[in-house]
Interface confidence: medium
Amino acid sequence: GWVWNQFFVPEEMNTTSHHIGQLRSDLDNGNNSFQYKLLGAGAGSTFIIDERTGDIYAIQKLDREERSLYILRAQVIDIATGRAVEPESEFVIKVSDINDNEPKFLDEPYEAIVPEMSPEGTLVIQVTASDADDPSSGNNARLLYSLLQGQPYFSVEPTTGVIRISSKMDRELQDEYWVIIQAKDMIGQPGALSGTTSVLIKLSDVNDNKPIFKESLYRLTVSESAPTGTSIGTIMAYDNDIGENAEMDYSIEEDDSQTFDIITNHETQEGIVILKKKVDFEHQNHYGIRAKVKNHHVPEQLMKYHTEASTTFIKIQVEDVDEPPLFLLPYYVFEVFEETPQGSFVGVVSATDPDNRKSPIRYSITRSKVFNINDNGTITTSNSLDREISAWYNLSITATEKYNIEQISSIPLYVQVLNINDHAPEFSQYYETYVCENAGSGQVIQTISAVDRDESIEEHHFYFNLSVEDTNNSSFTIIDNQDNTAVILTNRTGFNLQEEPVFYISILIADNGIPSLTSTNTLTIHVCDCGDSGSTQTCQYQELVLSMGFKTE
């Protein structure tokens, strides 16, 4: 049978031929009668056999990491007969490992993100190196990890390659670190090979910084003419954090929030100071407000960094705007009696300059020839007034600043002209009537009424009487109806057209004014010849046709 030991050949042998071992048949007595042959992959090129002795040699340098074993076949032939002495047999040549490969990190590049301020021991990332040498051959592929760069912030577990935080880091001081990890084989013993890798460790932001105002004092100005909602300026706080952690909200401390407000521009992270209520330079010419700023999002566990909000003081100066004069009243109503003499006092208006300068004021009345106004605001009449022509005047008073004539204010002025009893009552129309020749005594021939152009505080009351001469020798009499009308009656029986064709009766009408005024009004009465039918009358000078009163033709 075949006789051999297990064959090993060390890799990376530099000699031209290296004896591996011997293949031998136990029938071989050493007299060179047998011939040994080598078959299979590598036979003749990598391995050769001494045909006489069966010694095997490696004639090439081998690399275990390329090929760790060779399976060959052996034959032994009797030279004399040419026949196989032994059956063909397979055998194995193993390439034994030497430490000729350094550890390699195959998953490069390494990058990790870890929150800033993470506690010691926090896992960052695991790096893994691999060694092509034989793990079963001693310590050639047994690795140890160590940190070449990254202390004191990081550490690496020697056997696992797990990188952990060993000291708290502040992103605001440094936001990324390069850590260099070395892997050594031979568990670090002399002769070990090593490989390194770099790990980029980025710190993610946590909200460990509160926003702080850049300035402890801001100065802003606002015009007193500015409408509510006007932006009067911006304030700015800075937060060393980034992103959402740097978003902030501005506000005004409660006591100061009557007149101003602060809104936050979330794009620029600025605070915009807004006018909440109109300001008046003359009332208050400056304001002081305290503003504060806080982060928008603060997790509960980070509140310790945000205990006291940053504050700033804002000085706001109100800028004076020249304002038009201000009348004491929104409008004025005065009364003056009619017929008062020119230059009579009507009333006084007053306007003042609301500005601190207190400019003198000049007054004028627009479109009026009836009233005057002086620089003191005193209004007088420039003509006599007649209530019966105009009972009310709707005017406009203008006040102008003496030193700035562009500053003008106008308000309505209403003047009521009060009545005096300067008109006597008179017939409400022209009265002309007739009496028949055959009229009897006490016959009603006309009802009369009166009007008075004056205004009466109470109702008008008129008193009707005949004049003294008519009372004494009149053919007619009058009865006052006590309702501002009176009736005229015949005072005799029978009239003569030829003798006396027309009568003119003087009627006195008095009013109830104080003093009372009386007018004399003439009533014309024609004497007519009335037929029995009474429908047509023939009178001297003209024919009077009776129909719903009289129509003269």
Epitope: S216, Q284, N285, R290, F313, Q317
Partner: antibody
Framework: QVQLVESGGGVVQPGGSLRLSCAAS????????MDWVRQTPGKGLEWVAV????????YYADSVRGRFTISRDNSKNTLFLQMNSLRVEDTAVYYC????????????WGRGTLVTVSS | EIVLTQSPGTLSLSPGERATLSCRAS???????LAWYQQRPGQAPRLLIY???SRATGIPDRFSGSGSGTDFTLTISSLEPEDFAVYYC????????FGQGTKVEIK
């Protein structure tokens, strides 16, 4: 040390002019709003004028507006008050005063300089 | 403008006594913008109290301020010899106006 020192006071006739100066030292002058305040036996303390830290805004009491001008030279740490058309009632001790950073009260005053307006 | 009226005009007290000075405004002083100053003869005024009740830097705690709106008080709990002086109140909420002063003199 931190101090304000006024100068330039004196006797002047009505209608005349005078220029007061106030030298600041020991603090960052250019960071503070500065004021002039005067004191008369009759009216007591009366605020006169203010100028903002950078000179950008100036405001005056009604009694002096149009006659007095406040100015400053931050490079020389000096505050000025130019007084024209002086009246008898302007007679007073004039103080320069520093406004605090967060308000309008005065945390630092000079010793004052006397201005007498008399014919 | 806001007019400040101080009372009494003169306060005669002995060292160690308590002094209470009053300052009344003609209209409400916004946000308690009121200060107190001390003026010794021949010297410039010195800030004591601001914001109605906050003591200025270096001011002894025997000085205290109180009040809001229109009525304010300066209290000196126990008078020291150097406290005999004139005291002024000042409002700085609407322009700048001062009271006419209260003289604290030795009895």
């Amino acid at each position: 040390q931190v101090q304000l020192v006024e100068s330039g006071g004196g006797v002047v006739q009505p209608g005349g002019s005078l220029r007061l100066s106030c030298a600041a030292s020991g603090f960052s002058f250019s960071s503070y709003d500065m004021d002039w305040v005067r004191q008369t036996p009759g009216k007591g303390l009366e605020w006169v004028a203010v100028i903002w830290y950078d000179g950008s805004n100036k405001y005056y009491a009604d009694s002096v507006r149009g006659r007095f001008t406040i100015s400053r030279d931050n490079s020389k740490n000096t505050l000025f008050l130019q007084m024209n058309s002086l009246r008898v009632e302007d007679t007073a001790v004039y103080y320069c005063a520093r406004e605090t950073g967060e308000g309008w009260y005065f945390d630092l005053w000079g010793r004052g300089t006397l201005v007498t307006v008399s014919s | 403008e806001i007019v400040l009226t101080q009372s009494p005009g003169t306060l005669s007290l002995s060292p160690g006594e308590r002094a209470t000075l009053s300052c009344r405004a003609s209209q409400s002083v916004s946000s308690s913008y009121l200060a107190w100053y001390q003026q010794r003869p021949g010297q410039a005024p010195r800030l004591l109290i601001y914001g109605a009740s906050s003591r200025a830097t270096g001011i002894p705690d025997r000085f205290s301020g109180s009040g809001s709106g229109t009525d304010f008080t300066l209290t000196i709990s126990s008078l020291e010899p150097e406290d005999f002086a004139v005291y002024y109140c000042q409002q700085y909420g609407s322009s700048w106006t001062f009271g006419q002063g209260t003289k604290v003199e030795i009895k």
